[in-house]
């Protein structure tokens, strides 16, 4: 029955870019200006998205597809389909409730978006800090402190351990 009904439904013949107009005997009418239908058989057209303020038009609305927005310079998109525009901050900052603020000591952000993240704790991996962290950059971990003992080279691997009782060749 469902199949039969859909075959008999005159609206199913209405292509994308039109709607099935109940007020006009279910004739396929073109979508009015600033609206679209992306699939056939629709009984209404959807209102086009408008890109205003910090939103810029990336793609104009057409009768068959919605407009697409991106953000004005100095802002970046968030969310599916750029549903939000958020202000960029400088590297070494994060966006807080009061605007862009410098990363606290011990944290960094190497991008213009996102939050400040803690420096890597080199000692957790048994390593030492080779290059100190900044607001913009994470620390660089180097060899473990044991590898840096006097006479040890961080480049040449340690000699293989000899079994006890074996004299050198």
């Amino acid at each position: 029955f469902e199949r039969t009904r859909s075959l008999q439904d005159p609206c199913s013949n209405c292509p994308a870019g039109t709607f099935c107009d109940n007020n006009r005997n279910q004739i396929c009418s073109p979508c009015p200006p600033n609206s679209f239908s992306s699939a056939g058989g629709q009984r209404t057209c959807d209102i086009c998205r408008q890109c205003k303020g910090v939103f810029r038009t990336r793609k104009e609305c057409s009768s068959t597809s919605n407009a697409e927005c991106d953000c004005t310079p100095g802002f970046h998109c968030l969310g599916a389909g750029c549903s939000m525009c958020e202000q960029d901050c400088k590297q070494g900052q994060e966006l807080t409730k009061k605007g862009c603020k410098d990363c606290c000591f011990g944290t960094f952000n190497d991008q213009k978006r996102g939050i400040c993240r803690p420096w890597t704790n080199c000692s957790l991996d048994g390593k030492s800090v080779l290059v100190n962290g900044t607001k913009e950059r994470d620390v660089v971990c180097g060899p473990s402190p044991a590898d840096l003992s006097p006479g040890a080279s961080s480049v040449t691997p340690p000699a293989p351990a000899r079994e006890p009782g074996h004299s050198p060749q």
Epitope: G53, F55, C69, E86, K98
Partner: nanobody, 122 residues
Amino acid sequence: AVQLVESGGGLVQRGGSLKLSCVGSGFDFSDHAMSWARQVPGKGFEWVAYIYSDGSTYYADSVKGRFTISRDNAKDTVYLHMNSLKFEDMAVYYCATWRSQQVGRWDEYDHWGQGTQVTVSS
């Protein structure tokens, strides 16, 4: 339909004052946080000030102490009182709803006015 209409822009001497108004219609104004943003030709947008529905406010550092945002829910209007105007305040000023309530962020369902030009002369 939702509408925001700004007024009050114009030419003002450096150090002078202006009061911008933004009248909202087509939505429950008193329930919405509101914002003022500005765009300098050749530069991007920057947020200027925000006001929550309860009247609490936020200001950009560049305008703190000189600009005051306020609202009159009975008149569906948000204001921006601008004092000690500087050349760098010259811009088109926009009023917008502020659904995200995160400083520096607007979403696709926010509504924007058409903008009002503020020109600062010597």
